[in-house]
């Protein structure tokens, strides 16, 4: 539980920028939570650098991170999940920089999965469904989802739809006929917990039907 580095100590080290960012994942492995931190500057020499978290822990003062290549990682049940923890970059017993962080405000959900799109011929729409592991969780259960879709040929023209459920209906008339679409989804905490967008789900690809010339409607695939 060292304090900050004293003036004159570690002179070379102090020339570097040790700013870092972290995210937490709750109940990521059964009842275990995880905390992942990394330096914002990818060129930092991390050889002798360690991370330590102190405070807001259950029946321990501090925990040390494991180093996994460029990231630092903890998996534990010992987060109180209230109040701020002190997360420090250390070399030996000296702290180079510290941040006070409430782990409930840096939550990154797990990516949604099983994304699929089903065309309903009679309704002339597409039903988008996906799954999230958070439905089964005790803590981060309420999420906002961001569904993004684009015509495959439009590199950066994504259309985004925010929703709190895991089902979305896209009207056929809003899409181009006979076109290939890419769709993906990500999630962010939306109640009590705060934090970051999850990684995107794997993309799903679907084709819209041709227009049926006699009726002016699209043909099903």
């Amino acid at each position: 539980e060292s304090g900050y580095a004293q003036n004159g100590d570690l002179e070379d080290a102090e020339l570097d920028d040790y700013s870092f960012s972290c995210y937490s994942q709750l109940e990521v492995n059964g009842s275990q939570h995880s905390l992942t931190c990394a330096f914002e500057d990818p060129d930092v020499n991390i050889t002798n650098l360690e991370f330590e978290i102190c405070g807001a822990l259950v029946e321990v003062k501090c925990l040390n991170f494991r180093k996994l290549q460029e990231i630092y990682f903890i998996e534990t049940k010992k987060f109180l999940l209230i109040g701020k923890s002190n997360i420090c970059v250390k070399v030996g017993e000296k702290s180079l920089t510290c941040k006070k962080i409430d782990l409930t405000t840096i939550v990154k959900p797990e990516a949604p999965f099983d994304l699929s799109v089903v065309y309903r011929e009679g309704a002339n729409d597409f039903v988008v469904t996906f799954n999230t592991s958070h439905l089964q969780k005790k803590y981060v259960k309420v999420l906002m989802h961001d569904v993004a879709y684009r015509q495959e040929k439009d590199e950066n023209k994504w259309t985004h739809v925010n929703l709190s459920s895991t089902k979305l209906t896209l009207l056929q008339r809003k899409l181009q006929p006979a076109a290939m679409y890419e769709i993906k989804v990500r999630s962010i905490p939306d109640h009590y917990f705060k934090g970051f967008w999850s990684e995107w789900s794997p993309s799903y690809y679907f084709r819209t039907p041709e227009i049926n010339n006699s009726s002016g409607e699209m043909d099903p695939i």
Epitope: E1, C54, G55, V58, V60, L81, I82, K100
Partner: antibody
Framework: QVQLVQSGAEVKKPGASVKVSCKAS????????MNWVRQAPGQGLEWMGL????????SYNQKFKGRVTLTRDTSISTAYMELSRLRSDDTAVYYC????????????WGQGTTVTVSS | EIVLTQSPATLSLSPGERATLSCSAS?????MHWYQQKPGQAPKPWIY???KLASGVPVRFSGSGSGTSYTLTISSLEPEDFAVYYC????????FGGGTKVEIK
């Protein structure tokens, strides 16, 4: 205003259990830890444990682990401390204290509950 | 477990004098808090995170220190300052010092 109101004094026999309540008002009960601190007559302060009212997670001083149980009822913003297998040296004033999660100090205290253990 | 030793146990001073209370930790502590307690009353938060004054605490009080050595200073004692002061570490198991009693000489 922010207030913690504790239950009244108790007299117990050795080997018995005691349960002290602490009713919170004037703030969001689930937003702060509730800590329990005791003070034997003429002695200093001793932290016993805390509970996170949001999720019920507890953290105990190893000295009391196995004898103290902290619970809460969020519907009535009340925390409880139960101490079992009482001994005469458990005679003390028991305080509940709200934990400030930004700095981890006890920023609001209850008035105290005197527990006397005597045969 | 960290042990916090407060000295002196009793400080006998007159109103208007300067009071210096010490809290020594058996190993390094990042942050220290201080509480004031008067007879028959619950403790009150006094100084938190080494040097921040709790709400309503007069500016004649100050806190300082780092590592294993922390100090609470009262620049000029007022009658209402005579009480017991406890230091406390910020982290589990939130250990308190044994207290320093500031009494009227």
């Amino acid at each position: 205003q922010v207030q913690l109101v504790q239950s009244g004094a108790e007299v117990k026999k050795p080997g018995a259990s005691v349960k002290v309540s602490c009713k919170a008002s004037g703030y969001t009960f689930t937003g702060y830890t509730m800590n329990w601190v005791r003070q034997a007559p003429g002695q200093g302060l001793e932290w016993m444990g805390l509970i996170n009212p949001y999720n019920g997670v507890t953290s105990y001083n190893q000295k009391f682990k196995g004898r103290v149980t902290l619970t809460r009822d969020t519907s009535i913003s009340t925390a409880y401390m139960e101490l079992s297998r009482l001994r005469s040296d458990d005679t003390a004033v028991y305080y509940c204290a709200r934990g400030d999660g930004n700095y981890w100090y006890f920023d609001v205290w209850g008035q105290g509950t005197t527990v006397t253990v005597s045969s | 477990e960290i042990v916090l030793t407060q000295s002196p146990a009793t400080l006998s001073l007159s109103p208007g004098e300067r009071a210096t209370l010490s809290c020594s930790a058996s190993s390094s502590v990042t942050y220290m808090h201080w509480y004031q307690q008067k007879p028959g009353q619950a403790p009150k938060p006094w100084i938190y995170e080494i040097s921040k004054l709790a709400s309503g605490v007069p500016v004649r009080f100050s806190g300082s220190g780092s590592g294993t050595s922390y100090t609470l200073t009262i620049s000029s004692l007022e009658p209402e300052d005579f009480a017991v002061y406890y230091c406390q570490e910020w982290n589990y198991p939130y250990t308190f010092g044994g207290g320093t009693k500031v009494e009227i000489k």
